[in-house]
Interface confidence: medium
């Protein structure tokens, strides 16, 4: 399922963003899935669908529930559901760990704090930012764009930062404050040809005609922050995007892990609806960075029915 | 193995700008990742900025965040970077770098090119 978890705090803004990927030209519709009620798309209701967002202006705790979104193209249809929660404000400080962001790990060379989202948002500087709920201040800390970037960083910097700012639309002014964690390494990374854990090589996956596969292409990196390091599929040496196959999509944005220290990326290649067809297609993971490109290869064969019978 | 050639390169002054083109001898529609790499006097061989074939994502090495930005027309089989704000540390010779898909190689190195002078004084 094409699913995304987002969270606000009431009477905030909170914008979310259909996770079906489709052009600008395609029109999306968005629905509220308990009731299968259309939102309405009129900027004049607290809540309004604006193409592949889906507005809260501001938040209330009764939005919580599952939003579906459907990209409607010429040719197809694509669904996606978003997950939506919305929480009182805490009367103390602690943020809790249901409404934290990724964390981020820094090194004294790397110390940028990006600000969960703010991408979706119409905002303008200045942003600011808290630590563990105290604003931040003196000339180590330097609030640059969309991020927070921190001199000479120690092991002390650890910790939970927030960042607030306002989303202006169409004149009113909402607030929006978004918290992730942040830690400190103090070892040296270093970079490697990649290694991918996921596919093995010529790898034969079994799958269900009709029914849905995932792939999952993992690889590793190195140590620490990498400059350039990613993964993708290729279906018969062709960018998934340029295959043509709407069942057939790269889950979107690659999920970062760090495991035994190691920088690790991995990402998902989702078949809807398994066909024949399908059977006859080269998948291949790709691995890339600053040192080249491993691939694996991996084919998909029909998976046998269990006879029941004796 | 592509042949890769750059241009662009010259002398400019601190603040100014230059755009280096990457010209493919092959076709780079299929190309995995293409980038810029630079090389300072008595340095080693650095990553500046790259782009990967699939979606377009870009990666930028942090001291040219905000100042360089990559692209690839893959109609004319070229790579270009834009440097805006040039400082006097950007002066190296920078080398386009390709990694395309080969069916019949797993593990691929890159395929580079000569290199082109970029030089930032007044």
């Known amino acids: 399922k094409f699913s995304k978890q987002s969270w606000g705090l009431e009477n905030e803004a909170l914008i979310v963003r259909c996770p079906r990927q489709g052009k600008p030209s395609y029109t999306v519709d968005w629905y509220y899935s308990q009731t299968n009620k259309s939102i309405p798309t009129q900027e004049r209701n607290r809540v309004f669908a604006s193409g592949q967002l889906l507005k809260f202006l501001p938040a209330a705790v009764a939005d919580s529930g599952i939003y579906t979104c459907i990209v409607r193209s010429p040719t197809f249809n694509r669904t996606g559901y978003a997950n939506v929660t919305i929480y009182k404000k805490q009367s103390d400080c602690n943020v809790p760990d249901y409404l934290m962001y990724s964390t981020v790990s820094g090194s004294e060379k790397n110390s940028k704090i990006y600000c969960p989202t703010i991408d979706l948002y119409n905002w303008t500087a200045p942003l600011e930012w808290f630590k563990n709920c105290q604003a931040l201040q003196g000339s180590r800390y330097r609030a640059h764009k969309s991020f927070l970037v921190i001199d000479n960083v120690m092991t002390e910097d650890a910790g939970d930062y927030t960042c607030k700012f306002i989303h202006n639309e169409n004149g009113a002014n909402y607030s929006v404050t978004a918290t992730r964690s942040f830690t400190v390494k103090d070892e040296q990374g270093f970079s490697l040809f990649p290694v991918i854990g996921a596919p093995a090589q010529n790898e034969i996956k079994e799958v269900e005609i009709g029914k849905n596969a995932n792939l999952t292409c993992s690889a590793c990196f190195g140590k620490g922050t990498q400059f350039l390091a990613a993964v993708l599929w290729q279906l018969n040496g062709t960018k998934i995007t340029d295959f043509g196959e709407p069942r057939i999509q790269q889950e979107e944005g690659q999920n970062q892990s760090f495991s035994n220290g190691l920088a690790c990326l991995d990402m998902v290649l989702r078949i809807a609806d398994v066909k024949e067809e399908d059977l006859l297609l080269q998948y291949d993971c790709l691995a890339l960075n600053l040192h080249g490109l491993r691939r694996h290869t991996v084919r998909l064969s029909r998976k046998n029915p269990i006879d029941h019978h004796s | 193995e592509v042949q890769l050639v750059e241009s662009g390169g010259g002398l400019v002054q601190p603040g100014g700008s230059l755009r280096l083109s990457c010209a493919a001898s092959?076709?780079?529609?299929?190309?995995?990742?293409m980038g810029w790499f630079r090389q300072a006097p008595g340095k080693e061989r650095e990553f500046v900025a790259g782009?990967?074939?699939?979606?377009?994502?870009?990666y930028y090495a942090d001291s040219v965040k905000g100042r360089f930005t990559i692209s690839a027309d893959n109609s004319k089989n070229t790579a270009y970077l834009q440097m805006n704000s040039l400082k006097p540390e950007d002066t190296a010779v920078y080398y386009c770098?390709?990694?395309?898909?080969?069916?019949?190689?797993?593990?691929?190195?890159?395929?580079w090119g000569q290199g082109t002078l970029v030089t930032v004084s007044s």
């Open positions: 770098a390709a990694s395309r898909y080969a069916r019949e190689r797993d593990v691929h190195a890159y395929d």
């Open positions: 092959g076709t780079i529609t299929s190309a995995v990742f």
């Open positions: 782009i990967i074939g699939s979606g377009g994502a870009t």
